[in-house]
């Protein structure tokens, strides 16, 4: 493995981030801020890239399947949480094919820096970004009910995940800004229902002194839906998503123990978001390193079961966006908001003062997150350790409670190349495909002077396609030294978050 120039691998970094976003099933698109480190290894006619990417969350849901730099500027009237992250990524390119990059695995850590960037002095407006978004499910449900009244085709949608909640308090009143995903949970599973996934942004306004959040003075909601048929591979052509042996990606936060515990701190007990699970693997995942395959006939129809509201038809590919409201927009946070008049006179700009979120349990008096060598936890164990390879892969959504016998997958470590892997309509374990690749850990918010802890780098070994020795792993341990010509430059427009990234890595 040799160090390489960070600027030389920019196309790979940009494409890799697109593929990572494509694998994620909840949250917001990552945008590339900087290539922090880059190494590569050549194995026969395949190049293996080891990349460290500094990212920032946009305001576009991953469900939009947009390219990360096609995310439009955010609605200036809504507060935009600033969440940064760092991803360690292993990707491969076969035979210098200019279109063909595959992401093998990735680990990301993310954290909100909104509070750390807040300047609470001399401002009549206070903004909170809540970590415990679940508390606001009622508001999301209320907003969705209103939307259903105006949009018949949303009748069978239910709230899935509450993604972000912000509160803006000023002299004119209090506004809650709730972003959430929705899923279609029809009573009848056949024929397959369109528009299975959606993303909504609700703005609820209250009087200044209002204690009752049940009755907003004003409620505005915009939703967009994503057509599952657009996610499917036509003619059985497999998606070009990367590694043939693993598929999917899920975001996870530790719910049993905190993923990172700084010196002298106690556990963070605020609830974390549930695991993000990927959809079933595509019907055919043979490797296609020598160019994309030719069409091979229609894919098998998977029953669109909502028994656990899995991503049964949410294939690997994109989503057609249907906006249900002219003023709904895809958002991203890194441009300064224009000073438009917000309803009730608020100016909920991302760079406005933020009050520390009172519902977060900040461990007081702990040191800034240090540069832990190799991403190790200061107490000697990895802060973001992989879960064991065998997970319960059921993705219980809002439609039905999980069945009693929750199958677990412990049937080997994936099928040999060329074997089909299908997920049934929601019952029992997956017979192969144990390990879902890729993880995103949400850490507690950073405070001034802290830096984002590095993601772990202990990726499991993988064989490369068409390799002469398929049983011999081809990836090297993720490099711990830093390439001399790294990190790269921050993309323009992100100067305020650079202080939260480590500028040098452990040698």
């Amino acid at each position: 493995v040799s160090p390489t120039d960070c600027s030389a691998v920019e196309p790979e970094a940009e494409k890799a981030l697109d593929l990572i976003n494509k694998r994620r099933r909840d949250g917001y698109l990552f945008q590339l801020l900087r290539i922090a480190d880059a190494h590569l290894d050549r194995v026969e006619n395949t190049t293996v890239y080891y990349l460290v990417l500094d990212v920032q969350e946009s305001d576009c849901s991953v469900l939009s399947r947009k390219y990360w730099n096609d995310c439009e500027p955010p609605d200036s009237r809504r507060p935009s949480e600033i969440v940064i992250g760092q991803c360690k990524v292993i990707a491969t390119r076969h035979s210098h094919e200019s279109q063909d990059l595959r992401v093998i695995d990735f680990n990301c850590t993310t954290s909100s820096v909104s509070s750390a960037l807040a300047n609470t002095k001399d401002s009549p407006v206070l903004i909170d970004f809540f970590e415990d978004t679940e508390r606001y499910r009622k508001q999301a449900n209320k907003a969705l009910e209103k939307y259903k009244e105006e949009n018949d085709d949303f009748a069978s949608f239910r709230v899935d995940r509450i993604e972000r909640v912000a509160r803006v308090r000023g002299g004119e009143g209090t506004g809650y800004f709730v972003d959430f995903s929705v899923r279609n949970c029809p009573r009848h599973h056949f024929p397959r229902h369109p528009n299975v996934f959606g993303f909504c942004r609700a703005d609820l306004f209250y009087d200044v002194e209002a204690l009752d959040l049940e009755s907003p003075k004003n409620l505005v909601i915009n939703c967009e839906v994503f057509d599952p048929q657009e996610h499917e591979n036509i003619n059985g052509v497999p998606p070009h998503l990367g590694h043939p042996f693993h598929w999917g990606g899920h975001e996870r936060s530790s719910t049993t123990k905190p993923p990172f515990k700084p010196h002298g701190s106690r556990d963070h007990h605020h609830p974390h978001k549930p695991h993000e699970h990927g959809p079933p693997p595509p019907p055919d995942e043979r490797d296609h390193s020598h160019g994309p395959p030719l069409p091979q006939g229609p894919p098998p129809l998977l029953p669109m079961s909502c028994s656990s509201c899995q991503h049964a038809t949410f294939g690997t590919n994109g989503a057609q966006r249907h906006s249900h409201n002219n003023n709904s927009s895809d958002l991203h946070p890194h441009k300064h908001h224009s000073h438009e008049q917000h309803p009730h006179g608020h100016h909920p700009h991302a760079h406005h003062p933020h009050e520390h979120d009172t519902h977060r349990q900040h461990p007081h008096g702990h040191h800034p997150h240090g540069h832990h060598p190799h991403g190790h936890h200061p107490h000697g164990h990895h802060p973001h350790g992989h879960h064991p390879h065998c997970h319960d892969f059921q993705d219980y959504g809002p439609c039905d409670p999980p069945p009693h016998n929750q199958g677990h997958c412990c049937h080997g470590h994936g099928p040999p190349p060329g074997h089909l892997r299908r997920r049934g309509p929601g019952k029992g374990p997956r017979p192969f495909h144990c390990r879902q690749i890729g993880s995103v850990y949400r850490l507690p918010p950073l405070r001034k002077g802290e830096v984002l802890p590095l993601p772990e780098a202990n990726f499991p070994s993988f064989p490369l396609p068409h390799h002469k020795h398929p049983l011999k792993p081809d990836n090297q341990p993720f490099p711990q030294s830093v390439s001399e010509s790294c990190p790269g430059k921050f993309k323009s427009g992100f100067p305020q978050v650079s202080m939260f990234f480590t500028h040098t890595f452990p040698k």
Epitope: S64, D70, Q99, E232, L241, R321
Partner: antibody
Framework: EVQLQESGPGLVKPSQSLSLTCTVT?????????WNWIRQFPGNKLEWMGY???????NYNPSLKSRISITRDTSKNQFFLQLNSVTTEDTATYYC????????????WGQGTLVTVST | DIQMTQTTSSLSASLGDRVTISCRAS??????LNWYQQKPDGTVKLLIY???RLHSGVPSRFSGSGSGTDYSLTISNLEQEDIGTYFC????????FGGGTKLEIK
Amino acid sequence: EVQLQESGPGLVKPSQSLSLTCTVTGYSITSDYAWNWIRQFPGNKLEWMGYISYSGSTNYNPSLKSRISITRDTSKNQFFLQLNSVTTEDTATYYCASASYRYAWFAYWGQGTLVTVST
Amino acid sequence: DIQMTQTTSSLSASLGDRVTISCRASQDISNYLNWYQQKPDGTVKLLIYYTSRLHSGVPSRFSGSGSGTDYSLTISNLEQEDIGTYFCQQGNTLPTFGGGTKLEIK
């Protein structure tokens, strides 16, 4: 490998709409990549018009934004260009092309189709 | 928009020659410079992407170099099949193309 083929009328009257189809073989347009339209005016000047991505999101050249629409039919693995209110200035050879990531580079091109705008 | 300028609109060279075609951007394009060959029949092929990377199937006699605003394409050993028009294109922002350089054999 990816192959692209443009088709559509070779003659369009001014003020009408120009409609072209790009049929893709060897790869699903919903799997990855951005699917672009590029045109070449008489005299060789090339102009990027816009794309539809694997996900269905679109991005257009600002100079054409009010007149252009790129759509797709995933069941046929085709994507389409519609250019409204054409004038003789829109006479060009129209190419469809695939790009790995947005429009950073265009890896595969169709053979091009000449469209003449004339009465 | 970023303007791309190919100052030489046509050039002729002998078989076996080393030919260099240049391209200048109106601002820094961070190496997102690509080269295409258009044959007399109109077919277009990507040759070089991201300044210096050879697209698959392109002969190794083609190479690219440059940085910032100035870039060049070199054909080290001109062959008959290399006749055509060569275009540069920047992909750093909304794409724009150079005016083309027509290459003929003496």
